[in-house]
């Protein structure tokens, strides 16, 4: 008896539900009364769930598992695991016995995204070039253990004098603390990137340190070197800072935010007063922070049309400006898969598989692969259409000649968010099964 499971580990986020796919090929005349099905932990053989004597025998695993009773007769023995925990990670064996028997093991890889790192500085006052400072980067509640990278404002890796520690809490989630010791130059940006190696999720933060200098009257305007990435519909902060000279008061400040290319006014502050938003009433300054040299702009309810470069122009006695890029993004939905034709399929038939994913930005990259993970590049047609909001719907069509059976996976990647959404369909000649939605 051939029992089939995915070759790749099933990745599940902590707290979500996961489907461990398993299928078998029932012979003609098969009835559920003949089915004996066991799910167990591969290493310890601990019982997880079973089906015997025509009946679901229930969960033996903290009441968090379920079969798909309506699909069993078609050979779908998949297991639903609810409220996934770190402790669930490992290999699960699907054992099927009718007349013949067979088994296969599927790996569950548990993951949890790391929080946006918080950065602290010690000491954090009266810094001068040549001082040694300790920068701590902390990120919480991720799994598995993170990879931590430090770099300067030019993107050059900083590897010396870094100490990283990771501690697991009772749920098995890790808190990561990474400490960088540096000698300050004239000024510098230090970035910490916390990567989840399973999710390929990067969480990063940076701190810009501008040591005090003897006052020259010069206004140095600083913005992040990297684009600010903002999800459609959320709020974004375009950071901008300047170095106020001693005795500076807000009455002296003249601040303009404008679109870099067209010079269209976005927001301004002059004559000691916030002159308000000139940009659809969706912008705001941080009035309590202006006196300390924080000229950052809050942009609310970000739209695709906001993408581009914004210039922060500061004039006191001296003046200066700098431009910051806003990169807008929207995650793609989980792809839906359709099949044409979808009945009476035989080896040798040509089928058209359509993979559709909606409302993402920017344009997606689409990849097809077979059950073994081998890329399928021939006979693929992908189209992307933007709606009125500028969000893309992607439709990718794969034409294949069926073998005896096969799994076809479609992966829709958002190149900015590095977010992958995937769907798959398994075709087994007669009958055909769609894996349950994860």
């Amino acid at each position: 008896l051939e029992v089939q499971v995915p070759e790749d580990p099933v990745v599940a986020l902590v707290g979500t539900d996961a489907t461990l796919c398993c299928s078998f090929s029932p012979e003609p005349g098969f009835s559920l009364a003949q089915l004996n099905l066991i799910w167990q932990l591969t290493d310890t053989k601990q019982l997880v769930h079973s089906f015997a004597e025509g009946q679901d025998q229930g969960s033996a695993y903290a009441n968090r598992t379920a079969l798909f009773p309506d699909l069993l007769a078609q050979g779908n023995a998949s297991l639903r695991l609810q409220r996934v925990r770190v402790a669930d990670e490992g290999s699960f064996t699907c054992f099927v016995s009718i007349r013949d028997f067979g088994s296969a093991a599927v790996s569950l890889q548990v993951a949890a995204p790391y929080s946006k790192p918080s950065m602290t500085l010690e000491p954090n006052k009266d810094l001068r070039p040549g001082d040694t400072v300790t920068i701590t980067c902390s990120s919480y509640q991720g799994y598995p253990e993170a990879e931590v990278f430090w770099q300067d404002g030019q993107g050059v890796p900083l590897t010396g004098n870094v100490t990283t520690s990771q501690m697991a809490n009772e749920q098995g989630l890790f808190d990561v603390h990474s400490i960088l010791r540096v000698v300050l130059g004239a000024n510098g940006t230090y970035s910490c990137l916390v990567r989840n190696p399973v999710l390929q999720q990067d969480a990063h933060s940076s701190v810009t340190i501008t040591p005090q200098r003897s006052p020259t009257g010069a206004v140095e305007v600083q913005v992040p070197e990297d684009p600010v990435v903002a999800l459609v519909g959320t709020d974004a902060t375009l950071r901008c800072s300047f170095s106020p000279e001693p005795g500076f008061s807000l009455a002296q400040l003249n601040l303009i935010w404008q679109l870099t290319d067209t010079k269209q006014l976005v927001h301004s502050f002059t004559e000691g007063r916030d002159q308000g938003s000139a940009y659809a009433n969706r912008t705001a300054l941080f009035p309590d922070l202006l006196a300390q040299g924080n000229a950052s702009l809050r942009l609310q309810r970000v739209r695709v049309a906001d993408e581009g470069s914004f210039t922060c122009f500061v004039s006191i006695r001296d003046f200066g400006s700098a431009a910051v890029s806003l990169q807008v993004a929207a995650p793609y939905s989980k792809p839906s898969m359709t099949l044409e034709p979808n009945k009476d399929l035989r080896p040798g038939d040509t089928v058209t598989i359509t993979c559709s994913s909606y409302r993402g930005y920017p344009e997606a990259e689409v990849f097809w692969q077979d059950g073994q993970g081998v890329p399928l590049t021939g006979n693929v047609t992908t189209s992307q259409m933007a709606n009125e909001q500028g969000l893309f719907d992607v439709h990718s069509v794969l034409r294949v000649v069926l073998g005896a059976n096969g799994t076809y996976s479609c992966l829709v990647r958002n190149p900015v968010l590095q977010q992958d959404a995937h769907g798959s369909v398994t075709i087994t000649g007669q009958p055909m099964t769609f894996p349950p939605e994860a």
Partner: nanobody, 113 residues
Framework: LVQDGDSLRLSCAAS????????MGWFRQAPGKEREFVAA????????YYADNMEGRFTISRDNAKNTVYLQMSSLRAEDTAVYYC????????????????WGQGTLVTVKP
């Protein structure tokens, strides 16, 4: 006095203060017209600001070692005829005359058609 299409560089030297601590600007006043902003440069020279219709033909620069600010003008035309003033910026917008504390006496540039 220059010909239409010529180039010209104006210089303005300052004394009696810390030149490198101040932003500087150029203005001009054509016959019978109001004085208008041309360009400004920040104290260290890292930022420049131009009137919309001047950018491209005019370039402002400075040499803090020589306490001097320059205005390079190219493709001059008759309508560029004016008295050109150099000024030391105080508090305010670079394009506003009221932001400038000290002014030069001005130099007349005449562009012959």
């Amino acid at each position: 006095l220059v010909q239409d299409g010529d180039s010209l560089r104006l210089s303005c030297a300052a004394s009696g203060g810390t030149f490198s601590s101040y932003a500087m600007g150029w203005f001009r006043q054509a016959p019978g017209k109001e004085r208008e902003f041309v360009a400004a440069i920040s104290s260290e020279g890292g930022s420049t600001y131009y009137a919309d219709n001047m950018e491209g033909r005019f370039t402002i620069s400075r040499d803090n070692a020589k306490n001097t600010v320059y205005l390079q003008m190219s493709s001059l035309r008759a309508e560029d005829t004016a008295v050109y003033y150099c000024a030391v910026k105080g508090v305010g917008w670079p394009q506003e005359q009221a932001s400038y504390d000290y002014w030069g006496q001005g130099t007349l540039v005449t562009v012959k058609p």
